[in-house]
């Protein structure tokens, strides 16, 4: 069908509450494009009707609410005038009863669910709520160990919980709750957050921390398009450079002629005491020569690599 396949990271989600995923792939989605979502390679798109539990809303796919059976691979097809890209997003839904069990036991939780407060400092936690414009979010309530947080040391400011004079007792399981209104119906959003306490001033000292990748291999089919994010936390006042290298050369220089592998534009999210940086590497077409090579993400003195490997043959197909 002429669409290039791009494989994105997995998303691990909680059942019985709203979830939305935005299909954005700069620079493709910055121009005049149409975005259509499909589920598990279905021939017909995800519903366009806003009253449907799962429907598409412009570039978003919206689940109101997410259900256990919604796990699977969703494709978002981005069609431009002269291009077509199919982005694969693997959604895994788990049953989460946040009062019953520790959120720490869940696999591969993103940075949004694990946050750090700095001992003796004024700090904050962030409630990550990503939804399209058609969703209206009410005020956020915060809980610790299932009890609503009250007290002079805590202030709710938009999506943040400000914590003054952080103490060791502030570690533990938090949750932020908001009421989401869509098309006249109300839904509860509840995000669990595991909070740890650090004594270090600043965010992990002056050495940047590479959250992802983690020196691992990625299975990828020959000929596909692949995007890998490098996520780095660093102090707000840092002067570190972040980049992707191969054979100790910047990827943009190494592939200067073919431009087949490129480094993306760096973005960052600013937190109270640190920044979270993201810079991706895009393989427009994976070739045999890419397998087994360490592609290194550098952030100051920190490094982490990915190695591409061919998927093991699936003998069930024969």
């Amino acid at each position: 069908d002429g669409c290039k396949d791009i494989f994105m990271k997995n998303e691990i989600l909680s059942a019985s509450q709203p979830f939305a995923f935005n299909c954005t792939f700069p620079p493709i989605t910055s121009g005049e494009v149409s975005v259509t979502w499909y589920k598990n390679s279905s021939k017909i798109p995800v519903s366009k009707i806003i009253q449907s539990r799962i429907h598409q809303d412009e570039t978003w796919i919206l689940f109101l609410p997410m259900e256990w059976g919604d796990s699977g691979v969703y494709q978002c097809v981005i069609k431009g005038r002269d291009s077509c890209h199919r982005i694969h997003v693997n959604l895994t839904v788990f049953e989460k009863h946040w009062c019953d069990t520790s959120i720490g036991g869940l696999p591969n939780l993103s940075d949004e669910y694990k946050q750090i407060l700095h001992l003796g400092k004024d700090d904050s936690l962030t409630c990550h709520l990503h939804f399209p414009k058609s969703c209206v979010l009410g005020p956020i309530k915060w809980y610790k160990d299932c009890n609503e947080i009250k007290g002079e040391r805590f202030t709710v400011l938009e999506t943040r919980l400000l914590v003054s004079n952080v103490s060791a007792e502030d570690r533990g399981n938090y949750a932020c709750q908001a009421i989401l209104t869509h098309s006249g119906k109300q839904y509860e959003v509840l995000n669990g957050i595991t909070v740890s306490i650090t004594e270090r001033a600043g965010y992990g000292g002056s050495v940047p921390k590479i959250i992802y990748p983690k020196n691992h291999s990625i299975e990828v089919q020959l000929g596909t398009t692949l995007i890998v994010d490098c996520n780095v936390t660093d102090t707000k006042d840092n002067t570190n450079l972040r980049c992707w290298r191969v054979n100790n050369t910047l990827v943009d220089d190494y592939y200067d002629e073919s431009k087949r592998i490129r480094e993306g534009v760096e973005t960052h999210v600013s937190f109270r005491e640190h920044n979270l940086y993201t810079v991706n590497i895009t393989f427009l077409e994976v070739k045999m020569e890419d397998y087994g090579l360490p592609f290194m993400c550098h952030a100051g003195v920190s490094t982490a690599y990915i190695i591409l490997q061919l998927p093991a043959p699936d003998f069930r197909a024969y």
């Epitope: 589920k39 279905s42 021939k43 017909i44 798109p45 366009k48 009707i49 009253q51 412009e58």
Partner: antibody, heavy 113, light 107 residues
Framework: EVQLVESGGGLVQPGGSLRLSCAAS????????MSWVRQAPGKGLEWVSG????????YYGDFVKGRFTISRDNSKNTLYLQMNSLRGEDTAAYFC??????WGQGTLVTVSS | DIQMTQSPSTLSASEGDRVTITCRAS??????LAWYQQKPGKAPRLLIY???ILGDGVPSRFSGSGSGTEFTLTISSLQPDDFATYYC?????????FGQGTKVEIK
């Protein structure tokens, strides 16, 4: 390929009943809300009724409330419209619709004595 | 219920003309509006949804605009295949309503 095949239309006397069916294939039936839309001869489109993917929510146009019942059997990939107390003004082609995009060919209901 | 008022009810035009059909909602429906094309004896075909997004396989000469209560469907250069009846449709609530239709005929 998506297919929607309506059946059950025909000639019925005023006050009578009919049950329309819409057999669907080519997609995951339970993932989609479905609707019935009708069109009287030479007239415009008129929405009749809608139902959510799991069948839990049903919706009706004012003119059919209490007379028509929409339902679905997700195990059979079939949508139904039970029409009671039929009137002359219910004479129309009835289309089964998935989402906004996919329409059946329609089944003609004629209410006449 | 939300009433949809379409105008004009009939439009005479020639091949190559730029044609505009308007649709007004009795209350705000945000951008939850679709446009359909219907030919005699056939089921309607989706042209535009969410007020301005082109349906699958729909030629780029069709475009939609508007939000709230005022919407337009534009055919930039009328082709022989475009002579048909056009309907607007609001799906802001699941009490759907359609406009009364605009018949585009050959002048």
């Amino acid at each position: 390929e998506v297919q929607l095949v309506e059946s059950g239309g025909g000639l019925v006397q005023p006050g009578g009943s009919l049950r329309l069916s819409c057999a669907a294939s080519g997609f995951t039936f339970s993932d989609y809300a479905m609707s019935w839309v009708r069109q009287a001869p030479g007239k415009g489109l008129e929405w009749v009724s809608g139902i959510s993917g799991n069948g839990g929510d049903t919706y009706y146009g004012d003119f059919v409330k209490g007379r028509f019942t929409i339902s679905r059997d997700n195990s059979k990939n079939t949508l139904y419209l039970q029409m009671n107390s039929l009137r002359g003004e219910d004479t129309a082609a009835y289309f089964c619709v998935i989402d906004l995009d996919y329409w059946g060919q329609g089944t003609l209901v004629t209410v006449s004595s | 219920d939300i009433q949809m008022t379409q105008s004009p009810s009939t439009l005479s035009a020639s091949e190559g003309d730029r044609v505009t059909i308007t649709c007004r909602a009795s209350q705000s429906i945000s951008s939850w509006l679709a446009w359909y094309q219907q030919k005699p004896g056939k089921a309607p075909r989706l042209l535009i949804y969410k007020a301005s997004i082109l349906g699958d396989g729909v030629p780029s000469r069709f475009s939609g605009s508007g939000s709230g209560t005022e919407f337009t469907l534009t055919i930039s250069s009328l082709q022989p295949d475009d002579f048909a009846t056009y309907y607007c449709h609001q799906y802001n609530s699941y009490l759907w309503t359609f406009g009364q239709g605009t018949k585009v005929e050959i002048k």
